[in-house]
Interface confidence: medium
């Protein structure tokens, strides 16, 4: 079995982690998804799961965790707010259907949270559609009023992959008629 390479996210206490996990929509559109933590040497800990019906866009909040699931975009977005040093660890997006083994979606996330002052330069991850194997790092000055890792930056012109582009209602059902423009 393939072991997917980890993606390391280095953040500072108080920041928000945003991760986007693409999934194979033809296989997993109707499946429950979850965000799990992988404690060393222990069973995976399921932190938050999507709610039925899995074929419709949904948003689930569980403490500091938020799952935004949009099957029409073949994307599961995870947010962890107000990060603390104790949140450091290994996380993953999965297809969750106990008692079956979870299916890992994309690269596991190695989160490293450190204490930091408001006047240091910290790497900020722009978790948009990936251009490369590694997350995109942008060095930016951190301020207490700006605590999220996602920024309003122009979409890089090289980002042309489309997991999906919207839902059209056909005969009262969710039918995704997608343009795959590049």
């Amino acid at each position: 079995a393939i072991v997917l390479e980890e993606e390391r996210y280095d953040l500072v206490e108080g920041q928000t982690l945003t991760v986007k996990c693409p999934f194979n929509i033809m296989k997993y559109a109707n499946s429950q998804k979850a965000w799990q933590r992988l404690p060393d040497g222990k069973e995976p800990l399921t932190l938050v799961v999507t709610q039925r019906p899995f074929t419709r866009p949904s948003e689930v909040h569980m403490g500091k965790f938020t799952l935004k699931h949009d099957p029409s975009e073949a994307m599961l977005q995870v947010q962890m707010t107000d990060l603390q040093v104790t949140d450091s660890g290994l996380y993953r997006c999965v297809i969750y259907h106990p008692p079956n083994d979870p299916v890992v979606l994309f690269h596991p996330v190695r989160l490293v949270v450190t204490k930091g002052s408001s006047d240091v330069f910290t790497p900020v991850i722009i978790p948009i559609t990936r251009l490369t194997e590694r997350p995109i790092l942008i060095t930016t000055k951190y301020s207490p009023s700006d605590t999220t890792t996602t920024r309003s930056l122009p979409k890089p012109t090289a980002v042309v992959s489309s997991p999906g582009l919207g839902v059209t209602i056909i005969n009262g059902t969710d039918a995704d008629s997608v343009s795959t423009s590049s």
Partner: antibody, heavy 126, light 107 residues
Framework: EVQLVESGGGLVKPGGSLRLSCAAS????????MNWVRQAPGKGLEWVSS????????YYADSVKGRFTISRDNAKNSLYLQMNSLRAEDTAVYYC???????????????????WGQGTMVTVSS | EIVLTQSPATLSVSPGERATLSCRAS??????LAWYQQKPGQAPRLLIY???TRATGIPARFSGSGSGTEFTLTISSLQSEDFAVYYC?????????FGGGTKVEIK
């Protein structure tokens, strides 16, 4: 025996229409997403369109969007591709291919296109 | 869209020798990659999915490896029936895309 059989190809003038069919047998058709893939003479494979098991999710390549329509009839175990406003560059062998089952917890589920038909030739020429 | 680049375009190998085919993705597709074999006048046949899992009935001499952006199909000892065109395909993102193919021919 698991099988896909395409039909409906032929010679058509530019701007014309054709409807391709793909008859499935030997498996539970309604559990699988289905796809159309084409191959122009002497060229590589090009994905054309996909449809999920219950027709909720439909995808098209840019090159055919607005001209081609994929559909399926699970009661008849059939997949279709309605092709309108045909162009010379649509000339190709069209294959239907079985995609993954929606039931990922089926340990035998395969994620790619595991079953292909023999193909049907579509020629667009005046 | 995800561009898959296969190399080499043509590979000349003697029967019994090892063949190594490469597929590079323009951005990471995890392990959502398949390999197909196509012989003249025939439909493609699935060899490998999930980057490394052999499809039913595929001989053990075919193996796939890699994840992310770099993938390899290895045929450990080429048999006469293995001379064909091989395509990789990613199925994580739409549009689903295929590589341009590698033709494995007899040296």
């Amino acid at each position: 025996e698991v099988q896909l059989v395409e039909s409906g190809g032929g010679l058509v003038k530019p701007g014309g229409s054709l409807r391709l069919s793909c008859a499935a047998s030997g498996f539970t058709f309604s559990s699988y997403s289905m796809n159309w893939v084409r191959q122009a003479p002497g060229k590589g494979l090009e994905w054309v369109s996909s449809i999920s098991s219950s027709s909720n999710y439909i995808y098209y390549a840019d090159s055919v969007k607005g001209r081609f329509t994929i559909s399926r009839d699970n009661a008849k175990n059939s997949l279709y591709l309605q092709m309108n406003s045909l162009r010379a560059e649509d000339t190709a062998v069209y294959y239907c291919a079985r995609g993954p089952s929606q039931y990922y917890y089926d340990s035998s589920a395969i994620e790619a296109f595991d079953i292909w038909g023999q193909g049907t030739m579509v020629t667009v020429s005046s | 869209e995800i561009v898959l680049t296969q190399s080499p375009a043509t590979l000349s190998v003697s029967p019994g020798e090892r063949a190594t085919l490469s597929c590079r993705a323009s951005q990471s597709v995890g392990s959502n990659l398949a390999w197909y074999q196509q012989k003249p006048g025939q439909a493609p046949r699935l060899l490998i999915y999930g980057a490394s899992t052999r499809a039913t009935g595929i001989p053990a001499r075919f193996s796939g490896s890699g994840s992310g952006t770099e993938f390899t199909l290895t045929i450990s000892s080429l048999q006469s029936e293995d001379f064909a065109v091989y395509y990789c395909q990613q199925y994580l993102y739409f549009p689903l895309t295929f590589g341009g193919g590698t033709k494995v021919e007899i040296k």
